[in-house]
Interface confidence: low
């Protein structure tokens, strides 16, 4: 002989995949005091309960650890936790109080557990920049993961040297030594949930900021096709009045401030361009010389210089033979 | 009485589409999750996927994704799998299968429908 | 996914006699499911969760294993029991079956 009663609340709840939820169920009222049982929650059209507090009663060998019966008669609380949901454990949940020494039991209505697609993604939070060479802790967060679930498992993965700070239940702290070759990298954090078999991940691009490690000078000559200087050369032989434009260009990030200069400038010398492009229109004898360009950066400064030589045309000399 | 009654033996051609049917009876429809099987002739048995018909969740074998489709219509409680763009390897016996239980798969697949034929020919 | 490896692939015995299919996991399952399947018929489960015997299944039926190896014996096989038989997990996805081992009747 069964009695029923209906359950408060909702009809269904929601629950993302690996995450937690609270089947909130409260004993009847019309319970007598000196009712004796044992509680059980059923799953639908099952036989073999999901949870109980029978110490005889077998469960769901797929719920048992995961699913607990909160049971708390004094104060008529009958709830169901779920911890590391799973897709699987999307049904109609019922529970029913039995007594080893009376007639009847009770029965709830139903409930609906609706077992979503986990939407939820790790944080990464990065404090302030990260500088090439400077260690720097980045961390890994779930906020939203319920203390009473298992424990996440944090992976990450980066091409940058690393090395793995200390971990709580919902963070995991990496720390990071960035080199220049960094820059603009991924690195992912991947956090899986092995009571329900759920991963999840975040990938950020990294923001390195390093001095410049190269700069180099590209060579127009009239419509010919440009070459590339990579460091500091003697002297590269133009004709006189040739037109000459001069290209430098340098990593770094931020973008180094690029400048020329005439000769070898002093630290406070005025540049003769405040770009990285220097038109020299008519090579002619004021050109004759070094030229140096400067990448300016904050975190360090590097320059590159090329010695002009010009050539003279034998008709355009003064008392030329 | 539980009972999976699949739809009849169908010929096809290669490029084509065909949608069978698994009408059960004997049970809650919306309470169980129903499992598709494939199984050439001669062959082994391979699962394709599953769906719940109380809210439509379904899950596929990453093999059978794009190849399959599972629907259910609980007034009928009937569920269909609908597989598109038929080549020869798809020339099979399709079964519908109940779950024992939803939640621990404890009972495996305890109720089986009479198989759908396909074959692929042009 | 987990492959099941069945073996042997074909099993000849004579009315009486006990015969044993294993049935072993790449990895470790909490619990594996057989079928039994007779030309022309659909499966029929036969075996579940490692040891139960489904309804119907003659008692000279039993199933044992755990981790990555498990088993099925007939302790006096008889004609009837001519039939292929698969082993199922479903301890990750996707759900995977061995490729079967056929019992013949000599």
């Known amino acids: 002989q069964e009695r029923r009663f209906q359950l408060e609340g909702p009809e269904s709840l929601t629950v993302q995949e690996g995450l937690c939820v609270l089947v909130p169920c409260r004993l009847p009222t019309t319970l007598p005091a000196s009712y004796y049982g044992y509680g059980y929650w059923f799953l639908e059209g099952a036989d073999v309960p999901v949870a109980t507090n029978d110490p005889d009663e077998e469960v769901q060998e797929e719920t048992r650890g995961r699913f607990h019966l909160l049971w708390d008669p004094r104060r008529k609380n009958c709830s169901l936790s779920i911890r590391d949901a799973r897709r699987r454990d999307n049904a109609a949940y019922f529970f029913r109080l039995k007594s080893k020494w009376m007639k009847y039991g009770y029965t709830s209505s139903k409930l609906s557990v609706r077992v979503m697609a986990l939407t939820h993604r790790p944080n990464i939070s990065i404090p302030g920049t990260l500088e090439s060479g400077h260690p720097s802790n980045l961390t890994c967060s779930v906020p939203w993961v319920c203390e009473q679930g298992t424990p996440p498992i944090f992976s990450w993965m980066s091409a940058a040297p690393t090395s793995l700070g200390p971990r709580t239940t919902q963070s995991s702290v990496l720390t990071i030594t960035p080199r220049p070759q960094d820059h603009s990298t991924n690195l992912t954090c991947q956090v899986t949930f092995p009571g329900a078999g759920v991963t999840m991940e975040r990938t950020i691009q990294l923001n390195v900021s390093y001095a410049p490690q190269k700069v180099a000078i590209s060579i127009f000559q009239g419509n010919s096709a440009a070459f590339k200087i990579l460091q500091n050369t003697s002297s590269l032989p133009v004709l006189e009045g040739q037109a000459l434009r001069l290209l430098c260009d340098a990593d770094g990030n931020p973008p180094a401030h690029l400048s020329w200069f005439q000769g070898f400038p002093a630290l406070n010398a005025t540049p003769i361009s405040n770009t990285g492009v220097l038109e020299l229109p008519q090579v002619g004898s004021a050109e004759e010389g070094d030229f140096t360009c400067r990448a300016q950066h904050p975190l360090g400064s590097l320059q590159i210089s090329l010695s002009l030589f010009v050539h003279w045309k034998p008709e355009g000399r003064a008392g030329g033979v | 009485e539980v009972q999976l009654q699949q739809s009849g033996t169908v010929l096809a051609r290669p490029g084509a589409s065909v949608k069978m049917s698994c009408k059960t009876s004997?049970?809650?429809?919306?309470?169980?999750?129903m499992h598709w099987v494939k199984q050439r002739p001669g062959q082994g048995l391979e699962w394709i996927g599953t769906?719940?018909?109380?809210?439509?969740?379904?899950t596929y074998n990453q093999k059978f994704k794009g190849k399959a489709k599972l629907t259910a219509v609980t007034s009928a409680s009937t569920a269909y799998m609908e597989v598109s763009s038929l080549t020869n390897e798809d020339s099979a016996v399709y079964y519908c299968?109940?779950?024992?239980?939803?939640?621990?798969?404890?009972?495996?697949?305890?109720?089986w429908g009479q198989g759908t034929s396909v074959t692929v020919s042009s | 996914q987990i492959v099941l490896s069945q073996s042997p692939a074909i099993l000849s015995a004579s009315p009486g006699e006990k015969v044993t299919m294993t049935c072993r996991a790449s990895?470790?399952?909490?619990?594996i499911h057989w079928y039994q399947q007779k030309p022309g018929s659909s499966p029929k489960p036969w075996i579940y969760?490692?040891?139960n015997l489904a309804s119907g299944v003659p008692a000279r039926f039993s199933g044992s294993g755990s981790g990555t190896s498990y088993s099925l014996t007939i302790s006096r096989v008889e004609a009837e029991d001519a039939a292929t038989y698969y082993c199922?997990?479903?301890?990750?996805?996707?759900?995977?079956f061995g490729a079967g081992t056929k019992l013949e009747l000599k």
């Open positions: 299968s109940r779950e024992g239980t939803v939640v621990a798969n404890y009972y495996g697949l305890d109720y």
């Open positions: 004997g049970y809650t429809f919306t309470s169980y999750w």
């Open positions: 769906i719940y018909p109380g809210n439509s969740d379904s």
């Open positions: 990895s470790s399952v909490s619990y």
């Open positions: 969760a490692t040891s």
């Open positions: 199922q997990q479903w301890s990750s996805k996707p759900p995977t």
